[in-house]
């Protein structure tokens, strides 16, 4: 497969990975999204492990309220980290591909 | 870097290598999106190749209705198609992680 | 100290569109926090009406959901309600509220409430 | 929607009383209960978010418990200024939804 379907295999295959551990297989519940977050996206975490900081990034993502991230919503994260590398990307011309 | 950051830095330079040929090098005009669907999503394209439905595809991406597709509507696109590739995954439960 | 006020008319006349907008203050309106309305009938009875909270993102009850418009307004710190086609059965104190990002987003602050009356 | 169903509807008791207050749910909310107390023409205040934690401010002798669809609210020792209106409401799912209230009395 070709990395840009690769990409999107991992980002599917990712959600299950976690959502897969406690309650609905096909949601992520608060501790479920920490383990994905630690283990899977620690550059984005950072050192950010509070608790007050883990329940805002959850109620940010938790769009209809029901108090766990389903796949739509994670999508909805993870464009918005994509977003964020976009953004320091179009920073660094001397990283960007030829100018047009 | 982990798998799922790979995936983000994927989505990201994907886009710049198309977009980077022509025109306004943070958007995808129609022929970069046709040739970034056609050599990075093959499998999603499948035999679509016809004209009109390339128009269609343009036209449901651009949100903002300036006949070219920003990041931004290039992360709704791949949502989507993640979306649909997870409603894939769900319906194969052999497929999915251990059961709850 | 998170402050909630509650301002609109306390008389509407049945059929016409109540309004009620809400100013917070002490803190600001951040993407954090989602920013409800709950009205409490004269029975005692509670009912959520509906919030809007990150991004815009708004949800109402769906028992109200065809007579209702929720509004933010960041600059000024508001947000707002609108009923139409009101009843007497909407006479209520109007409460808003402010929920809290914790487990099962409690409604953390209250306004004090504002009595609309629905009455020709 | 999720029906909560808060018993007594009222009860006397007095200073000093160890009581308790109970809340059903039509279906399982999975400790996602709040509970609140409010006075005569006041706004309701917030006591307890998740079935058991305490909000900021609130005496310990408010203490919450349960799981899946039967939660309770305890008031160790009922003081002076706990004679009020104490409202369970869910936060499972939306639309969210409360109890009917319990009316504690002055015995």
């Known amino acids: 497969a070709c990395p840009l379907e690769k990409a999107l295999d991992v980002m599917v295959s990712t959600f299950h990975k976690y959502s897969g551990k406690e309650g609905d297989k096909f949601k992520l519940n608060k501790s479920e999204l920490k383990e994905l977050l630690t283990r899977e996206l620690p550059s984005f975490l950072g050192k950010r492990t509070d608790e007050a900081a883990f329940q805002k990034l959850m109620s940010n993502l938790d769009s209809n309220r029901d108090n766990e991230v389903d796949f739509q919503e994670y999508c909805v994260f993870l464009s918005c980290i994509a977003m964020m590398c976009n953004e320091f990307f179009e920073g660094f011309p001397d990283k960007q591909p030829r100018k047009k | 870097a982990c798998p799922l950051e790979k995936a983000l830095d994927v989505m990201v330079s994907t886009f710049h290598k198309y977009s980077g040929k022509e025109g306004d090098k943070f958007k995808l005009n129609k022929s970069e999106l046709k040739e970034l669907l056609t050599r990075e999503l093959p499998s999603f394209l499948g035999k679509r190749t016809d004209e009109a439905a390339f128009q269609k595809l343009m036209s449901n991406l651009d949100s903002n209705r300036d006949n070219e597709v920003d990041f931004q509507e290039y992360c709704v696109f791949l949502s989507c198609i993640a979306m649909m590739c997870n409603e894939f995954f769900e319906g194969f439960p052999d497929k999915q992680p251990r059961k709850k | 100290q998170v402050q909630l006020q509650e301002s609109g008319p306390g008389l509407v006349k049945p059929s016409q569109t109540l309004s009620l907008t809400c100013t917070v203050s002490g803190d600001s309106f951040t993407n954090d926090y989602y920013w409800n309305w709950i009205r409490q009938h004269p029975g005692s009875k509670l009912e959520w009406i509906g919030h809007i909270g990150y991004g815009g993102n708004i949800n109402y009850n769906p028992s109200l959901k065809n007579r209702l418009s929720m509004s933010r307004d960041t600059s000024k710190n508001q947000f707002s309600l609108k009923l139409s086609s009101v009843t007497a059965a909407d006479t209520a104190v109007y409460y808003c509220?402010?929920?809290?990002?914790?487990?099962?987003?409690?409604?953390?602050?209250w306004g004090q409430g504002t009595l609309v009356t629905v009455s020709s | 929607d999720i029906q909560m169903t808060q018993s007594p509807s009222s009860l006397s008791a007095s200073v000093g009383d160890r009581v308790t207050i109970t809340c059903r749910a039509s279906?399982?909310?999975?400790?996602?209960l709040n509970w609140y107390q409010q006075k005569p023409g006041k706004a309701p205040k917030l006591l307890l978010y998740y079935t058991s934690r305490l909000h900021s401010g609130v005496p310990s002798r408010f203490s919450g418990s349960g799981s899946g669809t039967d939660y309770t609210l305890t008031i160790s020792s009922l003081q002076p200024e706990d004679f009020a209106t104490y409202y369970c409401q869910q936060g499972n799912s939306l639309p969210r939804t409360f109890g009917g209230g319990t009316k504690v009395e002055i015995k």
């Open positions: 279906q399982d909310i999975r400790n996602y």
């Open positions: 509220t402010r929920e809290s990002f914790y487990d099962g987003y409690p409604f953390d602050y």
